[in-house]
């Protein structure tokens, strides 16, 4: 169908509750172009009808509530005038929450659900909350180690709840819970968060963190569009510079003349004591002589790779 | 590093009632659902049970519902396990062993507590 | 509940011998819930492989985990004298929690 393929990380979602997901893909949805959502490779599209449990509201693809059959791998497809991309995002929808059981929970942990606070200096914990237009978010409850949070350390502001002198004590597993209204009707959202005390200056000192990727390997097929992000948390007044690199090469300069490899555009979101960094690279087309090389992200003096390898083949096909 | 200690060896006899005790310690975080597992001699594991410290929630094995209660004192970070109405089938080695949150494993456990019913 | 049986139930292996056991599912289990203990006698089970492929903290790299929905394996490339002990696998993603019923391996 000339769509050309690219393969998103995994979203580990909570069953119950609403969850959304925004199909963009910043150098294509710029433009005039038209988004299509799929389920699981199917030819009939995602209802567009608002009253449908699962429903594609403009870009998005609204789940109102995500239920655990809904695991698998959704496509968004996006059509412009002159090209069309299928971006492939795989959804795990995990069962219960912690506070209920530990069984079924949630099996491993993304990023938003870590977040750090800084020993002794006034902090903030976010509650990620991404939805469409169409859905009204009401205040935010917070709840520490299943218990509501209460005392004047503690304040709701909007999407954030700011700690107080922080402490030792102050660490543990949060939640933030919301009601979200959407066409008359109520559904709540808790997402949980794990929290960690650092009693280092600003953000881990000067030493930038790479938070993804973790020097692993990543099954691509052979000719398709990959897209990794290189997710790094840093000082605010930092002077380090993010890049990807290949043979201790800029991937740019690398892939100078056919482009196929490109390095894209820094983009940072400002947090009250770091900065959270995401630059990413993209293969337009993996090819054999890709497999098996370090594609090193550098951020200051702190480097983590990844490497491309083939997926197993998978015999039960033949 | 997490250490579970737990209470000594225990010879009852049948119909009587036992409460067993794990204590956390070490770089335990806040959050955690302490586990009660059972092992028979020459037996496989079995799972009793879980309860949450925090707010003391549990969850059962239908198996054990009325033989098995499990009860936490938050301020000295120890859970306990009462069994009650003690048959010779009750005879074993019970562990404790925590959970935490986004890693749903058995990670540490404790060195087991024996108990043995006989008349 | 959903039933884990581990076979075979006995084994022994010599010296730099690969063993594999597997461990089966009465039912489907996401493999992020399936995970194996190592136990000897008179001591606690340890934590061995978690998630179905991802060692536990000090466990040697002979050691290796796979499988998805209701077949698992725990396979060791090649045996030593204190990989002698039984392993049982557990799920943790329906409750009951259940476990398997172990697998004694022992030294030739």
């Known amino acids: 169908d000339g769509c050309k393929d690219i393969f998103m990380k995994n979203e580990i979602l909570s069953a119950s509750q609403p969850f959304a997901f925004n199909c963009t893909f910043p150098p294509i949805t710029s433009g005039e172009v038209s988004v299509t959502w799929y389920k699981n490779s199917s030819k009939i599209p995602v209802s567009k009808i608002i009253q449908s449990r699962i429903h594609q509201d403009e870009t998005w693809i609204l789940f109102l509530p995500m239920e655990w059959g809904d695991s698998g791998v959704y496509q968004c497809v996006i059509k412009g005038r002159d090209s069309c991309h299928r971006i492939h995002v795989n959804l795990t929808v995990f069962e219960k929450h912690w506070c209920d059981t530990s069984i079924g929970g949630l099996p491993n942990l993304s990023d938003e659900y870590k977040q750090i606070l800084h020993l002794g200096k006034d902090d903030s914990l976010t509650c990620h909350l991404h939805f469409p237009k169409s859905c009204v978010l009401g205040p935010i409850k917070w709840y520490k180690d299943c218990n509501e949070i209460k005392g004047e350390r503690f304040t709701v502001l909007e999407t954030r709840l700011l700690v107080s002198n922080v402490s030792a004590e102050d660490r543990g597993n949060y939640a933030c819970q919301a009601i979200l209204t959407h066409s008359g009707k109520q559904y709540e959202v808790l997402n949980g968060i794990t929290v960690s005390i650092t009693e280092r200056a600003g953000y881990g000192g000067s030493v930038p963190k790479i938070i993804y990727p973790k020097n692993h390997s990543i099954e691509v097929q052979l000719g398709t569009t990959l897209i990794v992000d290189c997710n790094v948390t840093d000082t605010k007044d930092n002077t380090n510079l993010r890049c990807w690199r290949v043979n201790n090469t800029l991937v740019d300069d690398y892939y100078d003349e056919s482009k196929r490899i490109r390095e894209g555009v820094e983009t940072h979101v400002s947090f009250r004591e770091h900065n959270l960094y995401t630059v990413n690279i993209t293969f337009l087309e993996v090819k054999m002589e890709d497999y098996g090389l370090p594609f090193m992200c550098h951020a200051g003096v702190s480097t983590a790779y990844i490497i491309l390898q083939l997926p197993a083949p998978d015999f039960r096909a033949y | 590093q997490v250490q579970l200690q737990q209470s000594g060896t225990e010879l009852l006899k049948p119909g009587a009632s036992v409460k067993l005790s794990c204590k956390a310690s070490g770089n335990t975080v806040t959050s955690y659902w302490m586990h009660w597992v059972k092992q028979r001699p020459g037996q496989g594991l079995e799972w009793i049970g879980e309860i949450l410290p925090s707010t003391g929630r549990t969850n059962y094995n239908e198996n054990f519902k009325g033989k098995a209660m499990l009860t936490v004192d938050k301020s000295s970070s120890t859970a306990y396990m009462q069994l009650s109405s003690l048959a010779s089938e009750d005879s074993a080695v019970y562990y404790c062993?925590?959970?935490?949150?986004?890693?749903?494993?058995?990670?540490?456990w404790g060195q087991g507590t024996l108990v043995t019913v006989s008349a | 509940q959903i039933v884990l049986t581990q076979s075979p139930a006995i084994m022994s292996a010599s010296l730099g011998e690969r063993v594999t056991m597997t461990c089966t599912a009465s039912?489907?289990?996401?493999?992020?819930?399936l995970h194996w203990y190592q136990k000897k006698p008179g001591s606690s089970p340890k934590l061995w492989v978690y998630s179905t492929s991802n060692l536990a903290s000090g466990v040697p790299v002979r050691f290796s985990g796979s499988g998805s929905g209701t077949s698992y394996s725990l396979t060791i490339s090649s045996m030593e004298a204190e990989d002698a002990a039984t392993y049982y696998c557990?799920?943790?993603?329906?409750?009951?929690?259940?476990f398997g019923s172990g697998t004694k391996l022992e030294m030739k």
């Open positions: 039912s489907s289990v996401s493999s992020s819930y």
């Open positions: 062993t925590i959970v935490y949150f986004g890693n749903p494993w058995f990670a540490y």
């Open positions: 557990h799920q943790h993603h329906r409750s009951p929690v259940t």
